[in-house]
């Protein structure tokens, strides 16, 4: 059962796992949610009746029954983790805490103009978990405007104390706001020989990398595969760090793999969701329950539905035994990972999918695409929407992309002459325009947010957000696309598609079925040569075949240029402008979305 409200002046008795310090009860709830075992918590607020050394303590708790006895206590605030909830969860915390000193290991001290600058510095520093900034009113003259970057083993403060005229806050890496590079490569036959901060068992290097990503101190990792010569180290995932933030030594070793934390690109890559099955593999751990199940998929469902289950091993039924049902062993451990991994015993193992909601919905795998042809099939581009105007008569106006449950990203030039959002309708999950009838459900538009530097498509800033009146319930046919990661600026996308209901040639009409075309990206230098009369800026991205023939056209505007990278689709461009359609040596020009990620997040995450 999902309980989101906080219980004031209430303390949960017993069940303590560990105590951390958090600046608020709200953040204590987030910490509890991300902790592998925490189901409930008690936070102590500052209060004259409470010992100051207990202020800001967040006691993480567990219970077999999923609840604990309640006791009345002034200044105590208790609640439940969001593990029990189905809604999307985020660790992003933009709050600034006034007059609080969040203590940790200060490793960088420098002058900053503002708390915002200090927070940005923290967000763009690989080691930083949180910061404290002494404001202009701080009593000690020499310490005014000092920005202290801090880290701890847990990512949370080691203590929090009241201190006038300072502010504290957290790194915004988990809000997708970091400019740090995102290195997704996994290096085979490589060992990073730096200090280990922790070690866990993992079935493969991908899971090891994901564990590293959500471990607060891990910057890179080394994984020893099941073929590693030293038996005691097989399936061992070593979580590592270094002062420079990069591995100091790389050693060539067969059967080992190494890689980096994906912290700065975690909003566009699954980090918590380990969805694969591992055949002929047994996960050992504390046994929670043993239940009969028809298949390993059914066993995974049982694990996902049991809030305390972290991973499972399924033993298929022996022929004609137990109505063909196998045994499903639901398991847990102190850190969420198996305590040991064994091979060759016939089990099929995997992890709970309960944590998938901690990942961005946009990272969910969608159905395989149809190769060849130009017409799309249902569910192939579930982020694509058709934006209609109802004035003077209803018609398709532009394309757009779902980027959040209340947000559509499109082009600014679509709204030339649009006086009010009231005349707009957004249809999602549509394949054919002919499906749209009088009674077809749509999303009304609450607000049109056009980039304030937009003048005309050709001069850039051709980007707009639509805030919907109601939220989109994600399904297979309507779900978001990931924004590109700022750390992915140097990625070369090779699998890019433009989609829309636009014209197929310059003088044509809106198409009934959603069209798709695979189009290669063109460098900005090359693009500039093709458009000598225009300035192709770094905020634009171009795509097209030299010989022409495939391109976006009238009516595709605002729609996505979608590129697949590491199995995840990213919204790389917004269809903006071009000379004619599909002309030779005239590539299409798109808004370069990565350059607007800050703008998008600022507008969509505004309180």
């Amino acid at each position: 059962e999902c309980v989101t409200q906080l219980l004031k002046d209430t303390c949960f008795e017993g069940g303590d796992i560990t105590t951390v310090f958090t600046p608020s009860a709200k953040y204590c709830q987030v910490v509890c949610t991300y902790h592998p075992r925490c189901l409930l918590f008690t936070f102590t607020a500052e209060s004259p009746s409470e010992d100051p050394t207990r202020w800001f303590t967040c006691v993480l708790k567990d219970s077999v029954t999923e609840t604990l006895p309640r006791v009345n206590r002034t200044a105590a605030i208790s609640g439940y983790s969001f593990k029990q909830c189905s809604h999307q969860i985020s660790a992003c915390n933009k709050d600034i805490y006034v007059d609080l000193d969040m203590k940790g290991i200060n490793y960088n001290s420098s002058v900053a103009k503002s708390a915002q600058e200090c927070q940005e510095r923290c967000t763009d520093d690989v080691h930083c978990h949180f910061f404290t900034y002494a404001t202009r009113q701080f009593p000690s003259l020499e310490h005014r405007n000092i920005c202290l970057l801090k880290h701890t083993q847990t990512g949370t403060p080691t203590r929090i104390t009241k201190l006038d005229k300072v502010v504290s806050g957290f790194s915004l890496k988990s809000c997708a706001l970091s400019n740090l590079a995102c290195i997704r490569d996994i290096f085979p036959n490589t060992v990073f020989a730096d200090s280990n901060i922790d070690s866990v068992m993992a079935p493969d290097a991908f899971v090891c990398g994901r564990i590293c990503t959500h471990h607060p101190g891990c910057l890179f990792f080394t994984f020893f595969s099941q073929e590693w010569p030293k038996e005691s180290q097989r399936n061992l995932c070593l979580l590592k760090t270094s002062e420079s933030g990069l591995p100091s030594t790389r050693i060539k070793k067969s059967k080992a793999l190494s890689g980096f934390s994906l912290q700065s690109c975690r909003h566009s890559i699954p980090v918590f969701c380990h969805s694969s099955f591992y055949h002929d593999t047994d996960f050992l751990g504390e046994e929670l329950d043993i239940v009969a199940a028809k298949s390993h998929e059914a066993c995974q469902k049982l694990c996902t539905n049991a809030v305390r289950c972290q991973f499972f091993t399924y033993t298929p039924a022996q022929a004609s035994c137990n109505e063909g049902k196998g045994k499903c062993y639901l398991k847990l451990s102190s850190n969420g990972s198996p305590t040991k991994i064994l091979h060759g015993r016939g089990g099929i193992s995997g992890y709970t999918l309960r944590l998938c909601k901690m990942d961005n919905e946009c990272t969910t795998k969608i159905k395989p695409r149809i190769v060849g042809g130009t017409a799309s099939v249902r569910g192939e581009w579930p982020w694509q929407v058709t934006l209609h105007t109802t004035s003077p008569t209803q018609r398709h106006l532009c394309g757009g992309s779902i980027i959040g449950n209340q947000w559509i990203l499109t082009a600014a030039h679509c709204f030339y002459g649009v006086e009010s959002p009231k005349i707009l309708r957004v249809y999602s999950g549509i394949l054919n325009q002919s499906e749209i009838k009088e009674d077809t459900s749509f999303f009304g538009v609450q607000e049109i947010i056009i980039h304030d530097q937009y003048k005309m498509a050709e001069s850039g800033y051709d980007i707009a957000l639509l805030k919907l009146e109601t939220t989109v319930n994600y399904t297979d046919s309507q779900r978001p696309i990931c924004l590109p990661s700022k750390g992915d600026r140097n990625v070369i996308y090779t699998d890019c598609w433009v989609t829309g209901w636009g014209y197929r040639k310059l003088r044509d009409k809106i198409q009934n079925t959603l069209q798709k075309a695979k189009i290669p990206l063109v460098t900005n230098e090359e693009c500039q040569k093709r458009y000598r009369g225009h300035k192709i800026t770094h905020k634009m991205i171009c795509a097209g075949y030299r010989e022409g023939g495939k391109d976006a056209c009238k009516g595709d505007s605002g729609g996505p240029l979608s590129c697949k990278h590491n199995e995840v689709w990213h919204l790389v461009g917004i269809t903006s402008w071009g000379e004619g359609c599909a002309q030779r040596e005239r590539p299409g020009v798109y808004t370069n979305v990565v350059e607007y990620v800050d703008w998008i997040l600022e507008k969509t995450q505004a309180v």
Partner: antibody, heavy 115, light 107 residues
Framework: QVQLEESGPGLVAPSQSLSITCTVS????????IYWVRQPPGKGLEWLGM???????DYNSALKSRLSISKDNSKSQVFLKMNSLQTDDTARYYC??????????WGQGTTLTVS | DIVMTQSHKFMSTSVGDRVSITCKAS??????VAWYQQKPGQSPKLLIY???YRNTGVPDRFTGSGSGTDFTFTISSVQAEDLAVYYC?????????FGGGTKLERL
């Protein structure tokens, strides 16, 4: 845990120079300022100077011309150099860690005799 | 430079007494004053910073108050282990400076 340890020559002849090292552990010098304070026998505390996390320095006005503070972040060491020593520089020399201008951790001190 | 003056070099007290030590700054130092305790043969120990904030682990019988130029350090109920020298220090502006110290001794 946080520790600071001073090491010095113990005895120095008048007009000679002094070099004291403060070696720290449990924290990083890039994130904290370090102070030097001295205490002549039977007397009070005298603030000598400091080096900030970012390397800036501040000195006691009366001693500025004779003092120099530097550090090596990678070795976690802070250095106090003082020249033209006189007998009234005889004191116990302490290094201490900065917490918003106050000194939250102190070393045990090293005794210097100028004679 | 800012001069800190502790008017009493010595103060006599008994266990259980309330005692207050004063410190005066030669110019306004806002609330940037710290208090230290030093016992014979030991390094000074930070008790109070920014006038009234107690350092970690410091008993609540130690308090500080004041602002501008006049500051007071109070022990609400003196314990035998509190007999020591107490120094004030301004940390408003470098060069930072200490008061001359007040020795708290048994009556």
């Amino acid at each position: 845990q946080v520790q600071l340890e001073e090491s010095g020559p113990g005895l120095v002849a008048p007009s000679q120079s002094l070099s004291i090292t403060c070696t720290v552990s449990g924290f990083s010098l890039t994130g904290y300022g370090i102070y030097w304070v001295r205490q002549p026998p039977g007397k009070g505390l005298e603030w000598l100077g400091m080096i900030w996390g970012d390397g800036r320095t501040d000195y006691n006005s009366a001693l500025k011309s004779r003092l120099s503070i530097s550090k090596d972040n990678s070795k976690s060491q802070v250095f106090l150099k003082m020249n033209s020593l006189q007998t009234d520089d005889t004191a116990r020399y302490y290094c201490a860690r900065d917490y918003y201008g106050s000194k939250d951790y102190w070393g045990q001190g090293t005794t210097l005799t100028v004679s | 430079d800012i001069v800190m003056t502790q008017s009493h070099k010595f103060m006599s007290t008994s266990v259980g007494d309330r005692v207050s030590i004063t410190c005066k700054a030669s110019q306004d130092v806002s609330t940037a004053v710290a208090w230290y305790q030093q016992k014979p043969g030991q390094s000074p120990k930070l008790l109070i910073y920014l006038t009234s904030y107690r350092n970690t682990g410091v008993p609540d019988r130690f308090t500080g108050s004041g602002s501008g130029t006049d500051f007071t350090f109070t022990i609400s109920s003196v314990q035998a282990e509190d007999l020591a020298v107490y120094y004030c220090q301004q940390h408003y502006k470098t060069p930072y400076s200490f008061g001359g110290g007040t020795k708290l001794e048994r009556l």
